[in-house]
Amino acid sequence: SSSPTSSASSFSSSAPFLASAVSAQPPLPDQCPALCECSEAARTVKCVNRNLTEVPTDLPAYVRNLFLTGNQLAVLPAGAFARRPPLAELAALNLSGSRLDEVRAGAFEHLPSLRQLDLSHNPLADLSPFAFSGSNASVSAPSPLVELILNHIVPPEDERQNRSFEGMVVAALLAGRALQGLRRLELASNHFLYLPRDVLAQLPSLRHLDLSNNSLVSLTYVSFRNLTHLESLHLEDNALKVLHNGTLAELQGLPHIRVFLDNNPWVCDCHMADMVTWLKETEVVQGKDRLTCAYPEKMRNRVLLELNSADLDCDPILPPSLQTS
């Protein structure tokens, strides 16, 4: 997954006893929050693995790359990064692995340059629909976000609200149409069983979509048609059994796409014939020669590209009276 990177190494570390003396005041130009390391040359602040329970209030105004990883933030309230003067330069924000379970509406407001946001590896039981849009208007001001990294944000089963996790995430992605400029979206390792059908149509600028290591069984109701400039579609390590004609045609119609399909339990029966034909002709699938059948048992480990129509049969459906349980 992507994350902000720093290009210089001259970090200054502040002493813990300076912690809150000036936290309510505007930060001095060279000030570094307690428990953080700062490099003005690299415009980078790192507050990493420090068990912080809230976002430091005295972040330096120059910060462009902010790492707040490996902390214990729990809740990201509205305006968590709102400062006077604002953090106008902040472009890349990494909050991964900080035990966030709630991100509230407007958490990222007043960050006019925020292009990269990584919330991965947080058990987000409560992601507000307005976490990224900042308001509940039907059309919000466009978010500056270009990359949104949400890998492994699924909470444990017992901590989920009584609603679809997929639905909660999608609501946040679509609210106010704020993310129309999003180019990279990573949603890997989230136990997604399905992809809500409206999500992709409303993210027309997507270039990279990572849905790997989920539990997607089918793409039948998903349309990629609006993603005219999609460049990578990662579907590795899901539960896909077959891709049907409609999906194949849509993917083939995207001139810049590369599709990644490794490690899915492909079912090599009569329904697989169209996909096999397509695989033999297409150039869009990366490593297509590695795709193998998982079912039925007699076809296990057969290479899809080596199959022909005679290999792909379906057992006749028995009338109910002849079926055994």
């Epitope: 990177t5 990359e147 270039r207 990578s232 001139p255 810049h256 990366q286 490593g287």
Partner: antibody, heavy 115, light 107 residues
Framework: QVQLVQSGAEVKKPGASVKVSCKAS????????MNWVRQAPGQGLEWMGR????????NYNGKFKGRVTMTADKSITTAYMELSRLRSDDTAVYYC????????WGQGTLVTVSS | DIQMTQSPSSLSASVGDRVTITCRAS??????LNWYQQKPGKAPKLLIY???RLHSGVPSRFSGSGSGTDYTFTISSLQPEDIATYFC?????????FGGGTKVEIK
């Protein structure tokens, strides 16, 4: 903003090869596709091919098949275009262009083929 | 290969004029049509992609329209800095191909 910086001008003899480099910065938001386009003096633009930098997959214009090789080194965010068996009509400015729709272009590299 | 026919090859207009350039593809290109601006001695710059989408930072006086095989590029009010050559390009079917260019001058 994505920036592409190309290697300097080259003078080559017919039959020789040339290798042009293109270094990308502002990389976080750049595309995986790097295209190569050339422009002969006073002429239009001609697409030569493209490389998908993540896995090295290439598409070449049939006109250059067998003479052009595109490679990429992810570790240094640099793409390369090598054209072999040069002829005088290969004299042109060679551009790298990042993106499916060629969103960002390098400054160009003039390759002169002359005996 | 898909042929892209651009017209006119050159035009002269006054500052403030509306300028229109057309591009015709030899077959349907499903809106995968881009427009570039090139000034002398410089690299081309993307202005419009996918027929009508404005590339970031491009002034709103530039626009595009069309479908199927016929596409149009418009400068709503020509400015002195718009003096350049404009190219169309299709990225629907490999190999990508360009139009021959339209040189825009000030009267």
């Amino acid at each position: 903003q994505v920036q592409l910086v190309q290697s300097g001008a080259e003078v080559k003899k017919p039959g020789a090869s040339v290798k042009v480099s293109c270094k990308a910065s502002g990389y976080a938001f750049s595309s995986s596709w790097m295209n190569w386009v050339r422009q002969a003096p006073g002429q239009g633009l001609e697409w030569m091919g493209r490389i998908y930098r993540e896995d090295g997959h290439t598409n070449y214009n049939g006109k250059f098949k067998g003479r052009v090789t595109m490679t990429a080194d992810k570790s240094i965010t640099t793409a390369y275009m090598e054209l072999s068996r040069l002829r005088s009509d290969d004299t042109a400015v060679y551009y790298c262009a990042n993106g499916g729709a060629m969103d960002y272009w390098g400054q160009g590299t003039l390759v002169t083929v002359s005996s | 290969d898909i042929q892209m026919t651009q017209s006119p090859s050159s035009l002269s207009a006054s500052v403030g004029d509306r300028v229109t350039i057309t591009c015709r593809a030899s077959q349907d290109i499903s809106n995968y049509l881009n427009w570039y601006q090139q000034k002398p001695g410089k690299a081309p710059k993307l202005l419009i992609y996918y027929t009508s989408r404005l590339h970031s930072g491009v002034p709103s006086r530039f626009s595009g329209s069309g479908s199927g095989t016929d596409y149009t590029f418009t400068i709503s009010s020509l400015q002195p800095e718009d003096i350049a050559t404009y190219f169309c390009q299709q990225d629907n079917t490999l190999p990508w191909t360009f139009g021959g260019g339209t040189k825009v001058e000030i009267k």
